[in-house]
């Protein structure tokens, strides 16, 4: 049988009998559902270890994700030598695959938010991690991804890796602010804590069940809500990612540059678009309440504010302007700021 | 097959820079990570970070966070590393590897020394 | 950053025989997904290292099944069953859970 043809078995679940028989059918469907159980690994070591998908280890070893025995076709040929000079054959494959690029990458994603999370005192969202992780995959064309390096597909599917597809702006929710949490992240010019997410995250843990209860009322359709995602140069940037270093904000090369992770230092918000964090400590009368719940209204404006500015920083280094909103969040985003 | 090539080696002076290259055949560097290692002389191995060739997105230990510079060329299938300042501290072997840690280039001698 | 630690700098063994060497990491590589982050290489004098198991305890692609891994959340063991000339370098394991991802010291397998 093909490898390709081996895959897509796999991946149907007729291997695999703990497929649900409805699943068995939809590639997507069951690749999801495996991704969504299987959530990004890198976090906290000390983390609870119990796998929450109710599998033991052993259980795991010989019932390892479709998705990682589908993505690890990944040569041509299986060698495991630097130059093929292994003294050790061909002889046993392994059964198990590795992991596959987007997974490694959701992975990558889930331990640097674990580390900003630990850096700035916040307490990670697992669901996040495993939304975010259903979401990347999800959105590559699954069978194509699979012949990894088989010399079959070495060309992109520019369609399927899009970055503002792939990281929805949901993601941004991954970080929860702790219940203790009084620091002041007001953006400054080059401070180092001015990083929006954990602005935006702050804010967002203020705004508790009423931002679910809004996206629901407003329905976003996948494709509205990643056509409104923030992508920097076409490269695969999300909010996650902050500059490591001072050199990486401050690269001779624009290709280097391009290539790294943006400085969020630099955009000055005006007051009413930048996110308030009020003392936990502050006895909240009435008209806090009120201001509160107003700026629960406005976080989403907030949101889109925060990233326009960024725009208009990017645009002034000729960095290429990410494509246009759809119409449909335009008018959201107007009728959302005349409101304010 | 799949093969890293690694750029022969090299001798510089201390406070130099120096760019080490990996270049891949048998396979297209956007379709995985590319990790870059140190092994000191008579010493073990050490991480210095990653790169996703198709979008730059790069990640570093934090020791070699200023140090280090890690880029990629898609369009002639090759990673790079790029040090600064280079010290007595960073005459190693540095190793290119694929994502999983699957397949090793042949490594790069760098010596630094006046 | 998670600490590995391989005690043994060396084991000198006869071929044929069976030897297993280990490494303990200072933190739990158990994700909660059940997968256990550790790899081990082989590092033969001269050569580059070689993937000989990943994710505690599966085979990589071309490696005999005289290697086996096996461990809990932060001690590991390599097992080589009947060991043979070219098995001689130096082993290291690798943490692939957290970043930075880390590598124990090695423990070199030599010969008697």
């Known amino acids: 049988m093909k490898r390709k043809e081996r895959i897509a078995r796999r991946l149907e679940g007729i291997e695999n009998d703990t497929q649900p028989i409805l699943l068995q059918s939809c590639t997507g469907l069951v690749t999801h559902r495996l991704l969504e159980e299987d959530t990004p690994r890198y976090m906290r070591a000390s983390d609870p270890a119990s796998p929450h998908i109710g599998r033991s280890n052993e259980e795991e070893e010989t019932s390892d994700s479709s998705l990682e025995k589908q993505t690890r076709s990944k040569y041509c040929t299986e060698t495991s030598g630097v130059h093929g000079d292994s003294p050790y054959g061909s002889g046993t494959m392994d059964t198990h695959s590795l992991e596959s690029k987007a997974e490694r990458i959701a992975r990558y994603k889930a331990e640097r938010r674990r580390q900003l999370a630990e850096k700035y005192g916040l307490t990670l969202d697992p669901e996040a991690d495993s939304e975010y992780l259903s979401r990347y995959t999800k959105s590559r064309k699954e069978p194509d991804a699979v012949e990894k390096r088989g010399g079959k597909s070495d060309k992109q599917e520019e369609s399927s890796r899009d970055a503002s597809s792939l990281y929805p702006g949901t993601e941004t929710m991954g970080l929860r602010t702790c219940a203790g949490e009084s620091k002041d992240y007001a953006l400054h010019v080059g401070d180092g804590s001015s990083d929006p997410e954990v602005l935006l995250n702050i804010e967002n843990q203020r705004r508790g069940q009423e931002l679910s209860a809004t996206r629901q009322a407003h329905d976003l359709s996948p494709a509205a809500e990643s056509s409104s995602t923030f992508s920097f140069s076409g490269r695969d940037s999300s909010f996650t990612e902050v500059p490591r270093s001072p050199k990486h904000a401050h690269s001779s090369s624009l290709q280097q540059a391009a290539s790294r992770s943006p400085s969020f230092g630099d955009p000055q918000l005006s007051p009413e678009a930048r996110p308030r964090c009020t003392s936990h400590s502050e006895t909240p009368t009435v008209d806090d309440e009120e201001k509160v719940d107003e700026r629960a209204k406005l976080s989403v404006a907030a949101k889109r504010l925060l990233f326009r500015e960024m725009e208009k920083s990017f645009d002034e280094q000729n960095v290429p302007k990410r494509r246009s909103r759809n119409t449909a969040v335009e008018q959201r985003l107007r009728r959302l700021q005349d409101r304010s | 097959e799949v093969q890293l090539q690694q750029s022969g080696a090299e001798l510089v002076r201390p406070g130099a820079s120096v760019k080490l290259s990996c270049t891949a055949s048998?396979?297209?560097?956007?379709?995985?990570?590319m990790h870059w290692v140190k092994q000191r002389p008579e010493q073990g191995l050490e991480w210095i970070g990653w790169i996703d060739p198709e979008n730059g997105d790069t990640e570093y230990a934090s020791k070699f966070q200023d140090k280090a510079t890690i880029t990629a060329d898609t369009s002639s299938n090759t990673a790079y590393l790029q040090f600064s300042s280079l010290t007595s501290e960073d005459t190693a072997v540095y190793y290119c590897?694929?994502?999983?840690?699957?397949?090793w280039g042949q490594g790069t001698t760098l010596t630094v020394s006046s | 950053d998670i600490v590995m630690t391989q005690a043994a700098p060396s084991i000198p063994v006869t071929p044929g025989q069976s030897v297993s060497i280990s490494c303990r990491s200072s933190?739990?590589?158990?994700?909660?997904?059940?997968?256990?982050?550790l790899y081990w290489f082989l590092q033969r004098p001269g050569q580059s290292p070689q993937l000989l198991i990943y994710?505690?305890?599966n085979l990589a692609s071309g490696v005999p099944d005289r290697f086996s891994g096996s461990g809990s959340a932060t001690a590991f063991t390599l097992r080589i069953s009947r060991v043979e000339a070219e098995d001689v370098g130096v082993y290291y394991c690798m943490q692939h859970l957290e970043y930075p991802f880390s590598f124990g010291a090695g423990t070199k397998l030599e010969l008697k």
């Open positions: 590897t694929t994502g999983e840690f699957d397949n």
């Open positions: 933190k739990s590589l158990l994700h909660s997904n059940g997968n256990t982050y």
């Open positions: 994710r505690m305890s």
């Open positions: 048998g396979f297209n560097i956007k379709d995985d990570h």
